[in-house]
């Protein structure tokens, strides 16, 4: 878990298999989206910083009955060293801003892509 959590600045090393699978799942969600994701459910926006995996999970775990993001929720739990339950919030949440799950997933994916390009692209 220490290894998985330390991706603030990955440099020129590709992601672990687990992180690669998370990115691929986020890609699948964004590319295969037909109807509004999770019926347009809203979640708290988060600061995409070092603790973003736990923050993302804390936000998404409040969405229930949405099979499209269940795999993402399971994957994020593998990146968060502590147990996360619904209603739990960290300081990483932007508590005055709620966004649609679809936008949340897209923002998370874009951020992960930026992180991995950081060490490679000038």
């Amino acid at each position: 878990l220490t290894c998985l959590g330390g991706f603030a600045s990955p440099g020129p090393v590709p992601p672990s298999t687990a992180l690669r699978e998370l990115i691929e799942e986020l890609v699948n969600i964004t590319q295969n989206q037909k109807a509004p994701l999770c019926n347009g459910s809203m979640v708290w926006s988060i600061n995409l910083t070092a603790g973003m995996y736990c923050a993302a999970l804390e936000s998404l775990i409040n969405v229930s009955g949405c099979s499209a993001i269940e795999k993402t929720q399971r994957m994020l739990s593998g990146f968060c060293p502590h147990k996360v339950s619904a209603g739990q919030f960290s300081s990483l949440h932007v508590r005055d801003t709620k966004i649609e799950v679809a936008q949340f997933v897209k923002d998370l994916l874009l951020h992960l892509k930026k992180l991995f390009r950081e060490g490679q692209f000038n």
Epitope: P14, R117, F121
Partner: antibody
Framework: QVQLVQSGADVKKPGASVKVSCKAS????????IHWVRQAPGQGLEWMGA????????AYNQKFKGRATLTADKSTSTAYMELRSLRSDDTAVYYC????????????WGQGTLVTVSS | EIVLTQSPATLSLSPGERATLSCRAS??????LHWYQQKPGQAPRLLIY???QSISGIPARFSGSGSGTDFTLTINSLEPEDFAVYYC?????????LGGGTKVEIK
């Protein structure tokens, strides 16, 4: 469907520059990096560099750094590869290809652009 | 820079035979290795990604294996359309590099 359509064949004199275009369609242009690969006649494939169309960030093979420039125009979903100070050994087919993230495979390719450098 | 060495340079086989192509990396690249097929006058086509993951639309006779530094592309029971040049590609780190290719020709 995903398509990468490149500009037509070009003939240049040694010392000149060439600019090859690659128009993307069928997907969201800024979601994928565009990479450039060339192939000299009868030779293998050689990676030249890549651009992230969203930020304009680039990465180059050291061999082409300073001589090649990669750009992207988000408004037209078109990527460009300019190669300067052309030599006869730059005669090759130049391909653009897309990659979701650099460690992913090159899943779609342009048809290729033959650039001939001859005096 | 990661150097990929493909062997053999040329493989002469008959339709129906099995082709085994090798790609060796100069350092550990985990499973960040992709395989492409190229026919004369055409752009390369992706066959296998992450060393062993198959692509939809690619016949099941194509399979990949390996991890670390040694990788193999296997074509079970060659079809006439399989005679082409095959390249492996390092996806581990920049510069992205490709092997010199293996030409599979009709015996």
């Amino acid at each position: 469907q995903v398509q990468l359509v490149q500009s037509g064949a070009d003939v240049k004199k040694p010392g000149a520059s060439v600019k090859v275009s690659c128009k993307a369609s069928g997907y969201t242009f800024i979601d994928y990096e565009i990479h450039w690969v060339r192939q000299a006649p009868g030779q293998g494939l050689e990676w030249m560099g890549a651009i992230d169309p969203e930020t304009g960030g680039t990465a180059y093979n050291q061999k082409f750094k300073g001589r090649a420039t990669l750009t992207a125009d988000k408004s037209t979903s078109t990527a460009y590869m300019e190669l300067r100070s052309l030599r006869s050994d730059d005669t090759a087919v130049y391909y653009c290809t897309r990659i979701l993230l650099y460690y992913y495979p090159m899943d779609y390719w342009g048809q290729g652009t033959l650039v001939t450098v001859s005096s | 820079e990661i150097v990929l060495t493909q062997s053999p340079a040329t493989l002469s086989l008959s339709p129906g035979e099995r082709a085994t192509l090798s790609c060796r990396a100069s350092q550990n690249i985990s499973d960040y290795l992709h395989w492409y097929q190229q026919k004369p006058g055409q752009a390369p086509r992706l066959l296998i990604y992450y060393a062993s993951q198959s692509i939809s639309g690619i016949p099941a006779r194509f399979s990949g294996s390996g991890s670390g530094t040694d990788f193999t592309l296997t074509i079970n029971s060659l079809e006439p359309e399989d005679f082409a040049v095959y390249y492996c590609q390092n996806g581990h780190s920049f510069p992205l590099t490709l092997g010199g290719g293996t030409k599979v020709e009709i015996k």
